[in-house]
Amino acid sequence: IWELKKDVYVVELDWYPDAPGEMVVLTCDTPEEDGITWTLDQSGEVLGSGKTLTIQVKEFGDAGQYTCHKGGEALSHSLLLLHKKEDGIWSTDVLKDQKEPKNKTFLRCEAKNYSGRFTCWWLTTISTDLTFSVKSSRGSSNPQGVTCGAVTLSAERVRGDNKEYEYSVECQEDSACPAAEERLPIEVMVDAIHKLKYENYTSSFFIRDIIKPDPPKNLQLKPLKNSRQVEVSWEYPDTWSTPHSYFSLTFCIQVQGKSKREKKDRIFTDKTSATVICRKNASFSVQAQDRYYSSSWSEWASVPCS
Amino acid sequence: VPGGSSPAWAQCQQLSQKLCTLAWSAHPLVGHMDLREEGDEETTNDVPHIQCGDGCDPQGLRDNSQFCLQRIRQGLIFYEKLLGSDIFTGEPSLLPDSPVGQLHASLLGLSQLLQPEGHHWETQQIPSPSPSQPWQRLLLRFKILRSLQAFVAVAARVFAHGAATLSP
């Protein structure tokens, strides 16, 4: 058993049929010695008396808010949550495995630039009695500060018969150094509590590996005189790190015909303009990636050819 | 470069960008690792890193690029020695067209661009114990190539910025 925060405790249980559970001793936070009784949650049933209460915690029915009373007045509370371990593995019932980029990916994180700011998100099908808290640091043995904001419900989607909820959080490294080579990874820890179930999820990454630029902006097409060709141009996204002579992007461009099956030639360039053949009903698209490190490509930015 | 002269920024830019391409072709990003390549955070602490105080940011380069260039050169030589060591020469053997061979040559080429013959900056000692098992060797190769990718990315940014803003 360990203290999650004041008056909230997590009991770690090996979860299998007829498991013995954990013996827990609760102590009433009061100078009083006599006439103390204990109850669990809203039930008025007295579980025991005395300054301490010893219980055997085996299942969710044994978890909840234990209160010690004297003369009808509540003296202190202890909330017990359960953290299940099945076959040596902590339970992951609350969050959905996003399976990208690999199995057992519960938290996904992205950064739009090298400023030390990043966003993490996760998915669940649970809609009520759910709370999250997030902590983050750079490195774990001698952690450096990362500040995270409040967790927000960022999207709701219908998947078949189920509703899926996406939660996200934004974090910022306290002393970011965008030009340096990261040596220690960022660690993100999410605590999830659903009713009386506690779970924790972690992710470890370098900012450089989670970079995904915003799409290029300001796409423009300029037809060339007496030619089927057009000059296309675009700009770095506003959110990308500066100066661009240092934090450079590379681009992938393509002209997509009306039919999705039509062969599309992709051209890679470090410039912010190109000359292409852009037929009527086709569209021109461009995406960006860090020029020197193969992190994610941005989403496509597109403009119709006509 | 030693003694304060300027490097051939444009040449360094080209070669460092080639290094980036080679480093990624030698160890592409894959969705999952077949061998666990994540270790504790100390595993790559013995390789040189370009850190915050090394003057490799745009402002530091404008003030005095020498500190940064010295750091980059130390790293290049360190990685060049690693790629020539028995971590890479042992089993499983590199084939004649291995991108590691090209990487090795390009690391040497860029370090020489930064230091003409006759000047010698001190370089970090290469860690000597080399793994005996092929799987340990593979793991170490992946770790080295991953950290090399990060190192050459910063070096390439430095040279691109230098070529754009510091070239005479």
């Epitope: - | 030698a26 499983p92 053997s93």
Partner: nanobody, 121 residues
């Protein structure tokens, strides 16, 4: 040039056993993944079993519990132990290896020439 050479194919009775071998010209640590595939004339090549470096084998549903893939690092060889053979197992069996990217700039996928397995009573 990296080569894979299969052997051990031949005639086997239904319910019988056969052991296929695939010898590599380089250390099998050179391969990120090694696999056995099979092909019947006029049909697409299908995956039978694969094994990753440091991993354990994965099998196609049709052979699970009957076939076993293993390797011998010292002999630079991978094996396919075929037990309880069925008529539908008859095919040309190919060995495949995918080389680690850092070992070569070309031809990451290496194939053997194949070995014929015939199932007949």
């Amino acid at each position: 040039e990296v080569q894979l050479v299969e052997s051990g194919g031949g005639l086997v009775q239904p319910g019988g056993s056969l052991r296929l071998s695939c010898a590599a010209s380089v250390s099998i640590w050179s391969f990120k993944v090694m696999g056995w595939y099979r092909q019947v004339p006029g049909k697409q090549r299908e995956l039978v079993a694969t094994i990753t470096t440091g991993g354990s084998p994965d099998y196609a549903d049709s052979v699970k519990g009957r076939f076993t893939m293993s390797r011998d690092y010292d002999k630079r060889t991978v094996f396919l132990e075929m037990d309880s053979v069925k008529p539908e197992d008859a095919a040309v069996y190919y060995c495949n290896g995918r080389l680690w990217a850092h070992l070569t700039s070309s031809g990451h996928d290496v194939w053997g020439q194949g070995t014929q397995v015939t199932v007949s009573s």
